[in-house]
């Protein structure tokens, strides 16, 4: 299993939307992709979960564009706020 986030950093103005990309490899049939936000304290905050056989996930300002065949799962954060400045991680799990 492997997860790749090619974007090292992104800068966007407030009130705009940003899309963070994540590619993965897996031999599992059933899995979840999780997106987390890392606070300056290093604490990881769960944002949203995408199921491998589910429609695109959405939760508040967070939405996922899931391309299952391409093994791509992009997180879009809309209406950006200053507090959204952070490090974002995607993770793969069963």
């Amino acid at each position: 299993q492997k997860v790749t986030q090619a974007q090292s950093s992104v800068s966007m103005p407030v009130r705009k939307a940003v899309t963070l990309n994540c590619l993965y490899e897996t031999s599992w049939w059933s899995y979840y992709i999780f997106w987390y936000k890392q606070l300056p304290s290093k604490e990881m905050i769960f944002l949203i979960r995408q199921g491998s056989d589910e429609q695109n996930a959405k939760s508040g300002r967070y939405s996922v564009n899931f391309k299952k065949a391409a093994k791509s799962v992009a997180l879009t954060i809309s209406a950006l706020q200053l507090e959204d400045s952070a490090k974002y991680f995607c993770a793969l799990g069963e």
């Epitope: 589910e54 429609q55 996930a57 996922v64 299952k68 065949a69 391409a70």
Partner: antibody, heavy 118, light 106 residues
Framework: QVQLQQSGADLVRPGASVTLSCKAS????????MHWVKQTPVHGLEWIGA????????AYNQNFKGKATLTADKSSSTAYMELSSLTSEDSAVYYC???????????WGQGTPLTVSS | QIVLSQSPAILSASPGEKVTMTCRAS?????IHWYQQKPGSSPKPWIY???NLASGVPARFSGSGSGTSYSLTISRVEAEDAATYHC?????????FGAGTKLELK
């Protein structure tokens, strides 16, 4: 509204190649994969493969590797499928279809009937 | 690949009758999706994620099931329901479809 407009019926000779097209409208083409499905009376509906128009990443059903090649043109919002070394077994109706995440296929083209005959 | 087996292949019913068709998977899946197809037309999404009706689908249709056994039920069949119904899964890497159940009206 979402529309997938496919190329018309085709009659081709055995051994030849053919390219089918699927023009998407009513949504952002690069936001969704495009999948292709074959339908015959004998084998029913068979998934051929898919392409991510944004990156060009493709995935194929093992049974169609070497038979089908998927491409996409972002500028015209059109997906293409080339079928090579055609035989009578390739005679079928071919559909392009758009998935909703990893769930079901929520929009389908009208289908392209392909006949392979000498 | 996961093989989906639909039964019966042909289902004959009278208007107003309740009918059920089944879709069995060769190994366990989480969801099954159903499509309605009429001759000369492309498949239409009918029921997704096992039990959710697609937009415009009459409430007389319902879907249920889990694991390897799923079903589509029509509470009172109408003439316009005559069609072939295909089940589909995308639990495995490769999406697969059932061979279809053809619903005929007497």
């Amino acid at each position: 509204q979402v529309q997938l407009q496919q190329s018309g019926a085709d009659l081709v000779r055995p051994g030849a190649s053919v390219t089918l097209s699927c023009k998407a409208s009513g949504y952002t083409f690069t936001d969704y994969e495009m999948h292709w499905v074959k339908q015959t009376p004998v084998h029913g509906l068979e998934w051929i493969g898919a392409i991510d128009p944004e990156t060009g990443i493709t995935a194929y059903n093992q049974n169609f590797k070497g038979k089908a090649t998927l491409t996409a043109d972002k500028s015209s919002s059109t997906a293409y499928m080339e079928l090579s070394s055609l035989t009578s077994e390739d005679s079928a109706v071919y559909y392009c279809t758009r998935p909703r995440g990893g769930s079901h296929f929520d929009h389908w083209g009208q289908g392209t009937p392909l006949t392979v005959s000498s | 690949q996961i093989v989906l087996s639909q039964s019966p292949a042909i289902l004959s019913a009278s208007p107003g009758e309740k009918v059920t068709m089944t879709c069995r998977a060769s190994s366990s899946v989480r969801y099954i999706h159903w499509y309605q197809q009429k001759p000369g037309s492309s498949p239409k999404p009918w029921i997704y994620a096992t039990s959710n009706l697609a937009s415009g689908v009459p409430a007389r249709f319902s879907g249920s099931g889990s694991g390897t056994s799923y079903s589509l039920t029509i509470s009172r069949v109408e003439a316009e329901d005559a069609a072939t119904y295909h089940c589909q899964q995308w639990y495995s890497d490769t999406p697969t479809f059932g061979a279809g159940t053809k619903l005929e009206l007497k």
